[in-house]
């Protein structure tokens, strides 16, 4: 029987800057039970806090509702693993929630088959920021990618939209099944998961010609 | 609606001890840190000791360290301030306080009152 | 320790006088919290993160100042601002109040 092993806070994300959590691995048990508390304070104060929300984050995490979210402040957290032998820390985690923000994935995505008369033919491709992020406020810049690839080829085809939330593609394959994903990055942060894949058959009359 | 009440105050020899309960309603007790405050007769206002939501963190005011202890029952949502060695100079209204966010006391309980005398 | 010093102790302030109060603090702060206490009543929270209005705060309430020096300001004097006003510190252990400004009404 032995003191716990060394925990480490290995990753903290946020939706929209408003919430975030952190998660932790912990070390050995030592062959005993374990309580694990995280603790932090924020910079330029020195009066630490305990974790508000061990629930909602799942097992070895801590959720930060708003009321303990500050954007601009830097927090420093680490967690402690206590049993009856003794207790260890994990390494001091600095976290900015500016820099950890990872969108949930855009929202409403609609795929369609344009064939002007005039003009080639071309895929057009329409979705909507995720719910949680709001663009008004002018914190956020979201850029978007898109992928997409015939229903059985195993190379995804990634086109970069930019700011934008719809795009044009012209270079199909006339006849084959395309499946169609978005997803979204703040300026800073991380790419969201890709949304559900939407499915759009590409007619056999589609011309590729000029 | 968030209340605090404060109990078990009254009359305390030097040197005695009493525990003073705080029974928080209307708020998820077990995520705020929380505090007492104390105002002694015509004084100001005195922070006396933090927990923290799941007690991992403990302060306390240097007047009353060694012989005050905070803690908390989060299942039955209550604070506690055990005290000891109990002097003159701890002849005060208590208050039962929460932390909110980072917005120290924003809810006060009514208070109760702690005379020590001979 | 963070000592929190309070000036005036006593002001007086006739009906829709500008009042200023200040706090000083002995170290660099990032935020200050005022309280309003009326005679035997409990304090209420009055303004937080400096420059914040708590809850029911009346707009003619301010607050302001940064680094070891800040103030409260009301705009326009009214009886029902008579009251002890606290201006404390929670950023570091200890955590302090200032001694307190009573302001009365002319």
């Known amino acids: 029987q032995l003191p716990p092993g060394k925990p480490e806070i290995f990753k903290c994300r946020s939706p929209n800057k408003e919430t975030f959590t952190c998660w932790w691995r912990p070390g050995t048990d030592g062959g005993l039970p374990t309580n694990y508390s995280l603790t932090y304070h924020r910079e330029g104060e020195t009066l630490m806090h305990e974790c508000p929300d061990y629930i909602t984050g799942g097992p070895n995490s801590c959720h930060f509702g708003k009321q303990y979210t500050s954007m601009w402040r830097t927090y420093i957290m680490m967690v402690n693993a206590t049993n009856q032998m003794g207790s260890s820390f994990s390494d001091e985690l600095y976290v900015d929630v500016t820099y950890i923000v990872q969108p949930d994935p855009p929202l409403e995505l609609a795929v369609e088959v344009k064939q002007p008369e005039d003009r080639k033919p071309y895929l057009w491709i329409k979705w909507s920021p995720p719910t949680l992020i709001d663009l008004k406020t002018g914190w956020f810049t979201l850029l978007y990618e898109i992928r997409l690839k015939p229903e059985k080829a195993a190379e995804w085809e990634i086109h970069f939209a930019g700011q934008q939330t719809e795009f044009k593609i012209l270079s199909l394959h006339p006849g084959q099944k395309y499946l169609v994903q978005v997803r979204c990055k703040p300026d800073h942060g991380y790419w969201s998961a890709w949304s559900p894949a939407t499915f759009i058959q590409i007619p056999s009359d589609f011309t590729m010609n000029d | 609606e968030v209340m605090l009440v404060e109990s078990g105050g009254g009359l305390v020899q030097p040197g005695g001890s009493r525990k003073l309960s705080c029974a928080a309603s209307?708020?998820?007790?077990?995520?705020?840190?929380m505090n007492w405050v104390r105002q002694a007769p015509e004084k100001g206002l005195e922070w006396v000791a933090y927990i923290s939501s799941g007690s991992s963190i403990i302060y306390y005011a240097d007047t009353v360290k060694g012989r005050f202890t905070i803690s908390r029952d989060n299942p039955k949502n209550t604070l506690f301030l055990q005290m000891t060695s109990l002097r003159s100079e701890d002849t005060a209204m208590y208050y039962c306080?929460?932390?909110?966010?980072?917005?120290?006391?924003?809810?006060w309980g009514q208070g109760t009152t702690l005379t020590v005398s001979s | 320790d963070i000592v929190m010093t309070q000036s005036p102790a006593i002001m007086s302030a006739s009906p829709g006088e500008k009042v200023t109060m200040t706090c000083s603090a002995s170290?660099?702060?990032?935020?200050m919290h005022w309280y309003q206490q009326k005679s035997s009543t409990s304090p209420k929270l009055w303004i937080y993160d400096t420059s914040k209005l708590a809850s029911g705060v009346p707009g003619r309430f301010s607050g302001s100042g940064s680094g070891n020096s800040y103030s409260l300001t009301t705009s326009s004097m009214e009886a029902e601002d008579v009251a002890t006003y606290y201006c404390f510190q929670g950023s570091g252990y200890p955590l302090t109040f200032g001694g307190g400004t009573k302001l009365e009404i002319k």
């Open positions: 209307g708020f998820t007790f077990s995520s705020f840190g």
């Open positions: 306080t929460r932390f909110y966010g980072y917005i120290p006391f924003d809810y």
């Open positions: 170290s660099s702060l990032i935020y």
